[in-house]
């Protein structure tokens, strides 16, 4: 009778075991043992036991003792049972971005291990199972499906696998693969809205804002905000699911035309973009020309309005006759049009929309100076030691200094109030100067004595 | 437009002198011309003047002491009887009562007079 | 007596700085008083009129105010060549006067 020891052993992949062989007979013919494995035989005192070393034990292995005694042959076999985690659990790669309602395949590809009948696949939502299977085939396959939901934003997906030999009197195994992190966003099918001047001018600032609600997470959301190949630099705000880029754009003369304006919101692997035109133009505004700014009195003025040849322009709210980018009006300079003022309106159409300019210049006209009855009367009676004030207005532009003197030498005090003194009578010849000439004029101060009765 | 004094000289004390103002590019038919005098490190002093009628107004000091007088073209200054406190230079002065500001006021180059025994 | 006291007799300013003369008239000679500019060999120099317009060509930094009897000249942003004696004179009457013009102000500049 032939015997083995241990009769089933389980041990780690490449690890070694002794094996005893034993024999009932005292004398046997032979004894020994059958095995693929590296073996070395450990010496023993007596005939009947043989003690073994196997190494190198890569897989389940069976192998065999033999005796033979007088009495016939006998064989008994041990089991060798190699476990080992195994060499490979991996996720396979998804994009970490992932939609809100968006149904994600999670799936988690196990290579190796043993014993398979005690090696389990876990999918894992955090520490949450998802799924527990054994793992079947080489590599060994676990999917599952998770609809992807907004509180998933952050999670970390991950597989493990479980090689549990506690019944064998060994421990848990585990293996976890590298975590996969889910990012989940939402980003709404409407696209972003965009408010923005549909004309701009050259060489001015207009304001663009582009906005968008329903994001999440919205902090995470790319604004790219363009007028042609000119990037713009917005500030955004964030509120909680929606977003505010607001940037200042500036055109020059180069620019001048239909550009586009775009908006475009990134989020995930996904976008939204919006388009919109804007058109730059250039509208200087309308020139008013006069002959000189400044004429004397009787001199023919011409005031021409000038404007962008697109325009129509008003002077004075009489329109160019026939309408046009040019008008003018003809006077002769009076007084009355000293500090007139010449308005030159020009309308200009820009992508449907009416674009104004007026521009206005002051005509100075130079005259005078004068002095008449009304202003500077020629004759004053005013009693003695009465409190007065002579009055005389001398008109012109500019507006005249006037000076009244009786003799050459005594002034009378003009828009002063003078006690009336014998001095104050006589003659003064009131001079009234300025750059446009000289006129004069006498006034006659009557002085009244008190009557004593 | 301009004004020029002349006339003036060393003159004994009781000695009458006269000096004359030269005016041209106005008329004293309309002007009144002034007479001012300062004595070496002094003060401007007002004596008087001839008003474009021909009236004459003195400083309340000067009177009987000097007799300002005109001809279409020059007014004169009759020095009645200097005395060495006359010694100074005499200026000739257009309008010192009547001024534009583009009618700088015009003031001769002066005439020095001298009283001295 | 139409009269006019002028003071002070003299002031020192430093270049940059500001002077102000002072001149008052014996009784009222509304807005009649004159200012004039002395240098040493020099006949004056017209300035100011009807106590506060300024003479053609008289730069902005001299500035004349008041009426009445108080009169005032003010230099701001003194200059070397600033330095010399002013006279203020009431033009108004010419008669019943004593002197027409103020003592002077020596202003010397450091």
């Known amino acids: 009778q032939t015997s083995v020891s241990p009769s089933k052993v389980i041990l780690p992949r490449g690890g070694s075991v002794l094996v005893t062989c034993s024999t009932s007979c005292d004398q046997p013919k032979l004894l020994g043992i059958e095995t693929p494995l590296p073996k070395k035989e450990l010496l023993l005192p007596g005939n009947n036991r043989k003690v073994y070393e196997l190494s190198n034990v890569q897989e389940d292995s069976q192998p065999m003792c033999y005796s033979n005694c007088p009495d016939g042959q006998s064989t008994a076999k041990t089991f060798l049972t190699v476990y080992w985690t195994p060499e490979r659990v991996e996720l396979a790669p998804l994009p970490s971005w992932q939609p809100v309602g968006k149904n994600l395949t999670l799936r988690c590809q196990v290579e190796g291990g043993a014993p398979r009948a005690n090696l389990t696949v876990v999918l894992l939502r955090g520490e949450k199972e998802l799924k527990r299977e054994p793992a079947v085939g080489e590599p060994a396959e676990v999917t599952t499906t998770v609809l992807v939901r907004r509180d998933h934003h952050g999670a970390n997906f991950s597989c493990r696998t479980e090689l549990d030999l506690r019944p064998q009197g060994l421990e848990l195994f585990e293996n976890t693969s590298a975590p996969y992190q889910l990012q989940t966003f939402v980003l709404p099918a409407t696209p972003p809205q965009l408010v923005s001047p549909r004309v701009l001018e050259v060489d001015t600032q207009g304001t663009v804002v582009c906005s968008l609600d329903g994001l999440f997470p919205v902090s995470e959301a790319q604004v790219h905000l363009a007028l042609g190949d000119q990037r713009l630099n917005p500030t955004v705000t964030y509120g909680n699911d929606s977003f505010s880029a607001k940037a200042s754009v500036s055109v020059t003369a180069e620019d001048e035309g239909t550009q586009r304006l775009t908006c475009a919101v990134i989020l995930g692997n996904q976008s939204q973009e919006t388009l919109q035109t804007v058109t730059i133009y250039s509208f200087p505004a309308p020139n008013v020309i006069l002959t000189k700014p400044e004429v004397s009195e009787g001199t023919e003025v011409t005031v021409k309005c000038e404007a962008h040849p697109r325009a129509k322009v008003t002077l004075n709210g009489v329109p160019a006759q026939p309408l046009g980018p040019r008008a003018q009006l003809l006077l002769k300079a009076t007084p009355e049009d000293n500090g007139r003022s010449f308005s030159c309106s020009a309308t200009l159409e820009v992508a449907g929309q009416l674009i104004h300019k007026n521009q206005t210049r002051e005509l100075r006209v130079l005259y005078g100076p004068r002095l008449d009855e009304r202003d500077c009367p020629g004759n004053w009676t005013w009693p003695e030691n009465s409190q007065q004030t002579p009055m005389c207005q001398a008109w012109g532009n500019p507006l005249p200094e006037l000076k009244c003197l009786k003799d050459g030498t005594f002034p009378l005090p003009i828009g002063e109030s003078v006690t009336v003194t014998r001095d104050l009578e006589g003659t003064y010849l009131c001079r009234a100067r300025s750059t446009q000439g000289e006129v004069t004029r006498k006034v006659t101060v009557n002085v009244l004595s008190p009557r004593y009765e | 437009q301009s004004v020029e004094e002349s006339g003036g000289r060393l003159v004994t004390p009781g000695t009458p002198l006269t000096l004359t103002c030269t005016v041209s590019?106005?008329?004293?038919?309309?002007?009144?011309m002034g007479w001012v005098r300062q004595a070496p490190g002094k003060g401007l002093q007002y004596i008087g003047i001839i008003g474009s009628s021909g009236s004459t107004y003195y400083a309340s000091w000067a009177k009987g002491r000097f007799t300002i007088s005109k001809t279409s073209t020059t007014v004169d200054l009759r020095l009645t009887s200097p005395t060495t406190e006359d010694t100074a230079t005499y200026f000739c002065v257009r309008d010192p009562y009547d001024s534009f500001g583009d009618a700088y006021r015009l003031w001769g180059p002066g005439t020095l007079v001298t009283v001295s025994s | 007596a139409y009269d006019m006291t002028q003071t002070p007799a003299s002031v020192e300013v430093a270049v940059g700085g500001t002077v102000t003369i002072k001149c008052q008239a014996s009784?009222?000679?509304?807005?009649?008083c004159s200012w004039y500019q002395q240098k040493p060999g020099q006949r004056p120099k017209f300035l100011i009129y009807?106590?506060?317009k300024l003479a053609s060509g008289v730069p902005s930094r001299f500035k004349g105010s008041g009426s009445g009897t108080e009169f005032t000249l003010t230099i701001s942003g003194m200059q070397s060549d600033d330095a010399a004696t002013y006279y203020c004179?009431?033009?108004?009457?010419?008669?019943?006067?004593?002197?027409?013009f103020g003592g002077g102000t020596e202003v010397v500049v450091k």
């Open positions: 004179q009431q033009a108004y009457s010419s008669s019943n006067v004593d002197n027409a």
């Open positions: 009784q009222s000679i509304y807005s009649y």
């Open positions: 009807d106590a506060s």
């Open positions: 590019g106005f008329s004293l038919s309309s002007h009144a």
